[in-house]
């Protein structure tokens, strides 16, 4: 519990005194906060969160979901925290199933723990298919277990988080892994033509194929030495996983004289950028 | 680079119990995972049991569940072995393991842990 010093604010004080608490379900959870300056309680466990202004929680007959953080502030903003953890043998996971990770960033998979005393808390592939080789986690028994270094390959990756009961394995609901790439080369880019001789009157269309790993890669046309916004069309595929095609036409249906000049099609990422142009030359009808 | 020195290996009374202890030195992170092996003479190097250096989350081999507790001394940079009901069989040299990657999705696997120590000899005599 903290330390008062006098004249200075100092945080609330729980009871019980300690940072977990265990206790199991259909049994009552009872915690004090002392503080002249209370505000409130506020519990969070994954995305949800509950506030409490009475300045004792009592919830008679807990459950696994009353598993997680307890938290009370005071009018100063300094608050105090205890974890309790809603031993459930018919519930061990809390979970929720959203499982997104950028490549080569560390993704969590969200399934806490309502006993934090079970054993083997690790991952397992579903329907006994292996998981890779390289995967390697770090588990957290009030967050989840942590992937480390996300792998482009980990993409479409089906799992459980898994515990160690009374000489079983306890499997939770499946996770989906979404992977995001990471852009590690700048886009291709192509031209359908390289250069256009055109009467004046005539259509001019021009298409730049983008290629990329994913869709959030940008791209644009446009007019050397000029501001002007150009008129384009897009057409965009997915061929497979992380291989993202994007076609920007750029039309100009009457072409004149003064449109002559050199085109860019340009595209960038959080890699780089690549363009390429084409050169329009419009002679008058004579 | 990471140095693993284990200690508290011998000779025991089948039903007796042992403490191994492994000392790393360097720096402990999150990602730290320590664990323990074991090979008897002209068996392969299997897994006993192992522990996650942030939160502490324990995996043990089921032949070894209910009789071997691993923890860990994080001011100490140590993890221990405790090993009761000691069997004949749990005779083998104790290979004390590390790796700073995170534990591995297939921890039991020797083969993915990247520092070792020298082992402990443990005897248990019928």
């Known amino acids: 519990q903290p330390s008062v010093s006098p004249g200075e604010p100092s945080p609330p004080s729980i009871h019980p005194g300690k940072s977990d608490l265990i206790v199991r379900v259909g049994d009552e959870i009872r915690l004090l906060c002392t503080d002249p300056g209370f505000v409130k309680w506020t519990f969070e466990i994954l995305d949800e969160t509950n506030e409490n202004k009475q300045n004792e929680w009592i919830t008679e007959k807990a459950e696994a979901t009353n598993t997680g953080k307890y938290t009370c502030t005071n009018k100063h903003g300094l608050s105090n925290s205890i974890y309790v953890f809603v031993r459930d043998p018919a519930k061990l996971f809390l979970v929720d199933r959203s499982l997104y990770g950028k490549e080569d960033n560390d993704t969590l998979v969200r399934c806490p723990l309502t006993d934090p005393e079970v054993t083997n808390y690790s991952l397992k592939g579903c329907q006994g298919k292996p998981l890779p080789k390289d995967l390697r986690f770090i588990p957290d028994p009030k967050a989840g277990i942590m992937i480390k270094s996300v792998k482009r390959a980990y993409h479409r990756l089906c799992l459980h988080c898994s515990v160690d009961q009374e000489g079983k394995s306890v499997l939770s609901e499946k996770f989906i892994l979404k992977v995001r790439p990471a852009f590690k080369a700048v886009p291709v880019v192509s031209v359908s033509k390289a250069s256009y001789l055109l009467r004046e009157g005539e259509e001019f269309t021009v298409t730049c194929t983008i290629k990329d790993v994913s869709s959030s890669v940008y791209s644009t046309w446009k007019r050397e030495n000029s501001q002007t916004k150009l008129q384009e069309k897009y057409n965009s595929w997915h061929h497979g996983d992380f291989n993202y095609e994007r076609q920007a036409t750029l039309t100009i249906s009457s072409a004149r004289v003064n449109d002559s000049g050199v085109f860019m099609c340009y595209a960038n990422n959080t890699f780089g950028s690549a363009n390429v142009t084409t050169t329009l030359e419009v002679v008058d009808k004579g | 680079e990471v140095q693993l020195v284990e200690s508290g290996g011998g000779l025991v009374q089948a039903g007796g119990s042992l403490r191994l202890s492994c000392a790393a030195s360097?720096?402990?992170?999150?990602?730290?995972?320590m664990g323990w092996f074991r090979q008897a003479p002209g068996k392969e190097r299997e897994f006993v049991a192992a522990?996650?250096?942030?939160?502490?989350?324990?995996y043990y081999a089921d032949s070894v569940k209910g009789r071997f507790t691993i923890s860990r001394d994080n001011a100490k940079n140590t993890v221990y072995l405790q090993m009761n009901s000691l069997k004949p069989e749990d005779t083998a040299v104790y290979y004390c393991?590390?790796?700073?990657?995170?534990?591995?999705?297939?921890?039991?696997?020797?083969?993915?842990?990247?520092?070792w120590g020298q082992g402990t000899q443990v005897t248990v005599s019928s």
């Open positions: 522990i996650s250096w942030s939160a502490g989350m324990t």
């Open positions: 393991a590390a790796d700073q990657r995170g534990v591995p999705a297939y921890y039991s696997d020797y083969a993915l842990y990247d520092y």
């Open positions: 360097g720096r402990t992170s999150g990602s730290y995972v």
